[in-house]
């Protein structure tokens, strides 16, 4: 059974992931952002189901495409370079989902824009955090 300290650690990691995803969304989600039209041409794949930490495998698999899109963004919108930002997210995702269990991600048929993709994973983080508190 998870201890209160491990639950607290998980919660903090999820909050960190949530903040990173929100920062990316806020950085690009601007009607006046000239690069937004370019970013919206990229397709992202969404999980069929995302209710448990193991489903973060689906986010991990989309981090490389996410980095490619962020390379289009104006760097002033983010504190870190896309590569460093994605690297930080990857570390958190690996810790949260655990590397010892192999989970095959199932994707939905419908693809998503970067905005829809980020909103989906932000909702996921918020949902898991709410079950922990």
């Amino acid at each position: 059974a998870p201890t209160s300290s491990s639950t607290k650690k998980t919660q903090l990691q999820l909050e960190h992931l949530l903040l990173d995803l929100q920062m990316i969304l806020n950085g690009i989600n601007n009607y006046k952002n000239p690069k937004l039209t370019r970013m919206l041409t990229f397709k992202f794949y969404m999980p069929k189901k995302a209710t448990e930490l193991k489903h973060l495998q689906c986010l991990e698999e989309e981090l490389k495409p996410l980095e490619e899109v962020l390379n289009l963004a104006q760097s002033k919108n983010f504190h870190l370079r896309p590569r460093d930002l994605i690297s930080n997210i990857n570390v958190i995702v690996l810790e949260l989902k655990g590397s010892e269990t192999t989970f095959m991600c199932e994707y939905a048929d419908e693809t998503a824009t970067i905005v829809e993709f980020l909103n989906r994973w932000i909702t996921f983080c918020q949902s898991i955090i709410s079950t922990l508190t």
Partner: antibody
Framework: QVQLVQSGAEVKKPGESLKISCKGS????????IGWVRQMPGKGLEWMGI????????RYSPSFQGQVTISADKSISTAYLQWSSLKASDTAMYYC???????????????????WGQGTTVTVSS | SYELTQPPSVSVSPGQTARITCSGD??????AYWYQQKSGQAPVLVIY???KRPSGIPERFSGSSSGTMATLTISGAQVEDEADYYC???????????FGGGTKVTVL
């Protein structure tokens, strides 16, 4: 309503220079990318390049890089396509088109180029 | 440079279904857009983001994408659908756009 009005038809000789225009109205000109598309007689559409009038960020198709210059004057809401030395092979219809981004709730949709000018016919002949 | 490949022509009888394909290496990660161009007119957007229809475009126009192939389908083709159709997408970097070669749809 949102409109792009292009300058009139041009007949030029090889080696001459030319600048055609595309005037936007009914929207914030500086907030949308404007692209240029070539259509040679009886042929398909070719993407030439694009400009963001807000900061003049410009991208060219590798096929047109160095062949034409795309610019904009935001004070008069006008985009331009120019040649320094025309060739007979530049004979074509040239369209300007605006890229459209729509905000719907917390989401954004990108419609590609969905507002088009009427086209400018350029004829280059000796 | 990046290319999108379309068949030069597609023929269909009125009321039948026409399918136009567009292939490109980047399409698994890039949305396709479709334009209709009637003779002597400027192009009109008929599909965006692979499968979404702008307002004012008839329901008989639909789009889909799978792997490196995007498809525009005209279900129950009508005489007024006779036109050239172009797919449009970006290269892998997202910086440069490209049109397919175009497909002439004839409704016989």
């Amino acid at each position: 309503q949102v409109q792009l009005v292009q300058s009139g038809a041009e007949v030029k000789k090889p080696g001459e220079s030319l600048k055609i225009s595309c005037k936007g109205s009914g929207y914030s000109f500086t907030s949308y990318w404007i692209g240029w598309v070539r259509q040679m007689p009886g042929k398909g559409l070719e993407w030439m390049g694009i400009i963001y009038p807000g900061d003049s960020d410009t991208r060219y198709s590798p096929s047109f890089q160095g062949q034409v210059t795309i610019s904009a004057d935001k004070s008069i809401s006008t985009a331009y396509l120019q040649w320094s030395s025309l060739k007979a092979s530049d004979t074509a219809m040239y369209y300007c088109a605006r890229e459209t981004l729509a905000a719907v709730g917390s989401n954004y949709y990108y419609y590609g180029m969905d507002v088009w000018g009427q086209g400018t016919t350029v004829t280059v002949s000796s | 440079s990046y290319e999108l490949t379309q068949p030069p022509s597609v023929s269909v009888s009125p009321g039948q279904t026409a399918r136009i394909t567009c292939s490109g290496d980047a399409l698994p990660r890039k949305y396709a857009y479709w334009y209709q161009q009637k003779s002597g007119q400027a192009p009109v957007l008929v599909i965006y983001e692979d499968s979404k229809r702008p307002s004012g475009i008839p329901e008989r126009f639909s789009g889909s994408s799978s792997g490196t192939m995007a498809t525009l389908t005209i279900s129950g083709a009508q005489v007024e659908d006779e036109a050239d159709y172009y797919c449009y997408s970006t290269d892998r970097s997202g910086n440069f756009w490209v049109f397919g070669g175009g497909t002439k749809v004839t409704v016989l």
